[in-house]
């Protein structure tokens, strides 16, 4: 049940957490105007990862997409890659975590494989979750750079009497939404490999183990290790795994001078 | 048609208080700004300040302490109200619609209504 | 505060000339976000309420003769009126619409012989 329960909720965080990075890929606000310490304009600037907008104090808001694949900064290329690279991973992980679910029935599709499948999808997640943190995380060095290097160039004089304003961008929204939707997935995939260690096969799964012998038999309940008396072919406590183990029915014991009541 | 007219006391004295509404039509108000704009007898404009479609204004720094302006949005009417008045507060007082999608400029005009300082 | 200056005060031309009105910004009204200057001129016929010509330094106003035409970027700006008729005898004010306050320049009265 826990397995389960720890399954679905990785799945509901990591599917929140992608919808999130999408959301983030496609909000124009990851770079704001910022308005501390500069004139007040009646213009407000913003940019995304595909086009850049102004909206006038009047209402009117002019949005204009990067037609340019060679002329855009590398470090916006990159962002822009690893928030499609974790997008496409997340897609992946969330179509193969559904077959995965153990609410789910498809077929008679074994436990190990489920299990397979929902380290797979948590292993899709985890990745996914760190390329969004990491794609963010640069856009969010790269402004924080260009702020300080137009704040100590912010007024340029240009004849001494006009100057020239400098727009400088702070954190946009979309920031704050990677960095919260990456966490997310992250977090969704973790809980997807800890499942899966819940989903494998148990291995201290055994079968009740009889054995006959002359006369009478003595039946062994199944617990970690075999009863033990120094003889027979278990002299060192080995474990007694569900492939080895047979049933009453499969073996048959056979009368000997080592036989105990 | 897009109208605006103001409408303003004509006359008032020293020290007084001015208050000016503008009655507009043929849009509303909760999606255009509206900027009050003054012109002294022979002399240029000076803009006073504005009121935006989501209510948030901007004055003209000389003139922000004695200023306010405010709408409403059902009755399509902006008001100004200047206090402290001067001799040199003589001008006639514009009323303007900023226009959408024009680079934030003034895109039609009222009349004015003359307002005299004078004890 | 932004200053706006206008140049000339004043012109006196005859009807069918052309004739250019410069402004002046103390800072540039050019937005970097669009590539677009944030100017505005106005005409004041005797009278009557200012009229909207241009706007974005260079757009003009629908309704407006494409005689008035605007030019300029960052902090220099130009109106120019070719083929001009008696009806332009005006004054004309550039006003910066994107630092606040608005302020206008102080008008360039254009008179006709």
């Known amino acids: 049940m826990a397995v389960t329960a720890c399954q679905g909720l990785g799945f509901v965080v990591s599917l929140i957490g992608i919808a999130g990075i999408i959301a983030a890929t496609c909000m124009d606000q990851w770079s704001t105007q910022d308005l501390y310490n500069n004139p007040v304009t009646a213009v407000f600037n913003y940019q995304g990862l595909w086009r850049s907008c102004v909206r006038e104090s009047s209402g009117f808001t002019e949005c204009r997409g990067y037609f340019t694949l060679l002329g855009l900064p590398a470090m916006l290329q990159a962002v822009r890659a690893l928030m499609i690279v974790g997008i496409v991973l997340g897609a992946i992980g969330l179509l193969v975590s559904i077959f995965a679910l153990k609410c789910i029935r498809i077929g008679s599709m074994e436990d190990s494989a489920k299990a397979n499948m929902t380290l797979t999808s948590g292993i899709m997640f985890i990745v996914s979750g760190l390329c969004a943190i990491a794609g963010v995380s640069v856009f969010a060095n790269m402004l924080v750079t260009n702020f300080w290097m137009s704040t100590a160039n912010m007024y340029t004089g240009m004849g001494g009497m006009v100057q020239t304003v400098q727009t400088r961008y702070t954190f946009g929204a979309a920031l704050f939404v990677g960095w919260v939707a990456g966490g997310l997935t992250l977090i969704g995939g973790v809980m997807m490999c800890i499942a899966c260690r819940g989903l494998a096969p148990e291995e201290t799964n055994y079968k009740a183990v009889s054995y006959h012998a002359s006369g009478h038999s003595v039946a062994y309940k199944p617990g970690g290790f075999k009863a033990s008396t120094g003889f027979g072919s278990n002299t060192k406590n080995k474990k007694i795994y569900d492939g080895g183990a047979r049933t009453e029915d499969e073996v048959q014991s056979y009368p000997s001078k080592h036989d105990y009541v | 048609q897009v109208q605006l007219k103001e409408s303003g006391p004509g006359l008032v004295a020293p020290s007084q208080s001015l208050s000016i509404t503008c009655t507009v039509s043929g849009f509303s108000l909760s999606n255009y700004g509206v900027s009050w704009v003054r012109q002294p007898p022979g002399k240029g404009l000076e803009w006073l300040g504005v009121i935006w479609a989501g209510g948030n204004t901007n004055y003209n720094s000389a003139l922000m302490s004695r200023l306010r302006i405010s709408k409403d949005n059902s009755k399509s009417q902006v008001f100004l109200k200047m206090n402290s008045l001067q001799t040199d507060d003589t001008a006639r007082y514009y009323c303007?619609?900023?226009?959408?999608?024009?680079?934030?400029?003034?895109?039609?005009w009222g009349q004015g209504t003359s307002v005299t300082v004078s004890s | 505060d932004i200053v706006m200056t206008q140049s000339p005060s004043s012109l006196t031309v005859t009807a069918g000339e052309k004739v250019t009105m410069n402004c002046k910004s103390s800072q540039s009204l050019l937005n970097s976000g669009n590539q677009r200057n944030y100017l505005s001129w106005y005409q004041q016929e005797p009278g009557q309420p200012p009229k909207l010509l241009i706007y974005?330094?260079?757009t003009r106003e629908s309704g407006v003769p494409d005689r008035f035409t605007g030019s300029g970027s960052g902090t220099d700006f130009t109106l120019t009126i070719s083929n001009i008729q008696a009806e332009d005898l005006a004054l004309y004010f550039c006003?910066?619409?994107?630092?606040?306050?608005?302020?206008f320049g102080s008008g360039t009265k254009l008179e006709i012989k």
């Open positions: 006003q910066n619409a994107y630092f606040y306050p608005f302020t």
């Open positions: 974005w330094a260079s």
């Open positions: 303007a619609r900023h226009g959408y999608g024009k680079g934030n400029a003034m895109d039609n």
